[in-house]
Interface confidence: low
């Protein structure tokens, strides 16, 4: 099984114990590590952070001691903007320039492949996204002719049914991608006006979502139905939680909220907590399991957080094995307890390790 793990370059800027550099990563934990994110400037793939080249080096030296580890560079992301990707992908010359720029950049910096994180193609971009993937793969095949190992090509896709329908020609893009990471999280947010888990495995009877699409099981099943081969589908598991501020004394699933939860001490983003911040939160909190959804949530005062723990990630891994998927994807290593100092287990990356162990279990 693949264990595809994202590392985010901006995690270096978190203060104190939240700051994470690639040299803190475990070289034997994941089969693939994806560095997020690269930029595109003047239609060429490019660095994003001022010290990306240094960090690329840190990451890729992990392979010195684990030659089986594959590293990929992810291009795009939330801050890149869908419009910029659209302009490049829809223009034949821009697309060609971008595609040509990728292999030398990856080779120079020691990466084994490219991950496309176009979040998200619009309805009009659907065909262009397919073309981009098809042509990128053709370039990778051509570039590898002189006996080089062919560069890998993957994509991170939304798990939302509406986005899947409008953005992706699943059957076609699946032919050209080495694997597909389906982002089976962020199904529920403060916009719903109620509490709810952002990454349920199933639609439980407790689910407050107005649809039956907002769960991992549906998204995976839908992707398979649309023609994604199980052997290429990698299922996303979050090492972060989504939090809400309760608006009343109700604390269950579907309770009214006044907005996102208060920012974490290190991640500093309202409505989001890293797993290591959740471990802090759990001291003195009340933990509940949403049985049908097979995930936990915790409450403390007027704060509510839906997250994944070692038990829920094991359920998710069992599920992906049952559906004979290619493996698991983790967003993100730097949101797990990467120091092993927050969650009281004396274990670095407890969630990712639980995923790895469950994948290896017979």
């Amino acid at each position: 099984y693949k264990l595809v793990c994202y590392y985010t370059s901006w995690s270096q800027y978190r203060e104190g114990d939240g700051s994470c550099f690639p040299d803190a990563l475990d070289r034997f934990l994941c089969t693939h590590i994806i560095y997020s994110f690269a930029n595109i400037s003047n239609d060429h793939i490019d660095t994003w952070e001022w010290n990306d080249v240094t960090l690329y080096g840190m990451l890729n030296t992990l392979k010195n001691r684990n030659p089986n580890l594959k590293t990929l560079l992810s291009v795009g992301g939330w801050n890149f903007g869908s419009q910029r990707f659209s302009k490049i992908a829809s223009n034949t010359q821009s697309r060609r320039t971008f595609i040509k720029s990728v292999p030398p950049f990856l080779r120079t910096h020691g990466f084994d492949g490219l991950d496309l994180a176009w979040l998200y193609p619009g309805r009009r971009d659907k065909q262009h996204f397919t073309t981009l993937i098809k042509e990128m793969k053709a370039e990778f095949i051509k570039e590898a002719q002189p006996g080089k190992k062919q560069l890998l090509l993957s994509a991170a896709l939304s798990a939302g049914k509406v986005t899947i329908d409008s953005s992706y020609d699943i059957a076609k893009i699946s032919q050209h991608l080495d694997f597909i990471s389906i982002m089976t999280y962020d199904f529920h947010g403060a916009w719903r006006g109620t509490t709810g888990h952002h990454s349920p495995l199933f639609r439980g009877q407790e689910d407050a979502s107005p649809d039956r699409f907002s769960n991992t099981d549906y998204a995976v099943g839908y992707m398979l139905r649309l023609g994604a081969p199980a052997s290429k589908l990698v299922m996303g598991i979050p090492t972060f939680g989504r939090s809400f501020t309760l608006a009343s004394s109700e604390t269950g699933v579907g309770a009214p909220i006044s907005g996102p939860g208060i920012p974490g001490r290190f991640t500093k983003e309202a409505g989001t907590l890293a797993y290591y911040e959740i471990c802090d939160f759990l001291r003195g909190a009340t933990v509940h399991r949403i049985l049908g959804q097979q995930v936990p949530y915790a409450t403390k005062g007027n704060q509510w957080v839906g997250y994944d723990d070692q038990e829920s990630v094991k359920s998710k891994v069992q599920y992906l094995k049952d559906r004979q998927l290619a493996g698991a994807m983790v967003w993100a290593l730097d949101l797990d307890d990467f120091q092993g100092s927050f969650c009281g287990q004396d274990l670095r990356f407890p969630l990712t390790n639980a995923i790895k162990d469950a994948l290896a279990a017979t």
């Epitope: 199933f202 439980g204 039956r212 099981d217 099943g221 839908y222 992707m223 398979l224 049908g292 069992q318």
Partner: antibody, heavy 119, light 109 residues
Framework: QSVKESGGGLVQPEGSLTLTCTAS?????????MCWVRQAPGKGLEWIAC???????TYYASWAKGRFTISKTSSTTVTLQMTSLTAADTATYFC?????????????WGPGTLVTVSS | AQVLTQTPASVEAAVGGTVTIKCQAS??????LAWYQQKPGQPPKLLIY???YLASGVSSRFKGSRSGTEYTLTISDLECVDAATYYC???????????FGGGTEVVVK
Amino acid sequence: QSVKESGGGLVQPEGSLTLTCTASGFSFSSSYYMCWVRQAPGKGLEWIACIYNGDGSTYYASWAKGRFTISKTSSTTVTLQMTSLTAADTATYFCARDADYAGVVLNLWGPGTLVTVSS
Amino acid sequence: AQVLTQTPASVEAAVGGTVTIKCQASESIGNALAWYQQKPGQPPKLLIYVASYLASGVSSRFKGSRSGTEYTLTISDLECVDAATYYCQCTWYGNVYLAFGGGTEVVVK
């Protein structure tokens, strides 16, 4: 909330019949799969087909493809068209709606309608 | 195609006793299994979903469990009203295939 089947009765071998499932107290919104299941006298349950109202997708048991067609005909009715009927198709036909649980879990069943294929 | 093999076909037990019904899946379906109870002349009634979760209004005397591809329905403190035929059903969606097991008749003495 309830569902009720109609349209059953006696039919000649090689004949055709259309069964209707009518909902009361709810409409076939995008949240539901509607399914047909049959049960021959003294035998077990046998799944025939489902329709997913969200996108109109249809699903059939391999043996039912070609002879049975499931359709949504209105916001409160689903039909099952059956052709080339034989004595082996004699059964009580149930219409069932799925629950908002994981997978297609049938928690709302009609009382059934009996179809007898005989000359 | 998925095949669910239910055993035994029939079982007899006394009031207050315990009955165990097995359902073996031919392929891996994870927790995608439901159990139904059916009495003569009536449609089936949902008991258990996601292998082990009790449907609303169902007595806690009914318990579902799973070990690999083998699923078990246990009825404890048997009552006369439990006399019925019990069916397992696989519940995948996304790739819908709703196989039923052959059924197990429970006779209560």
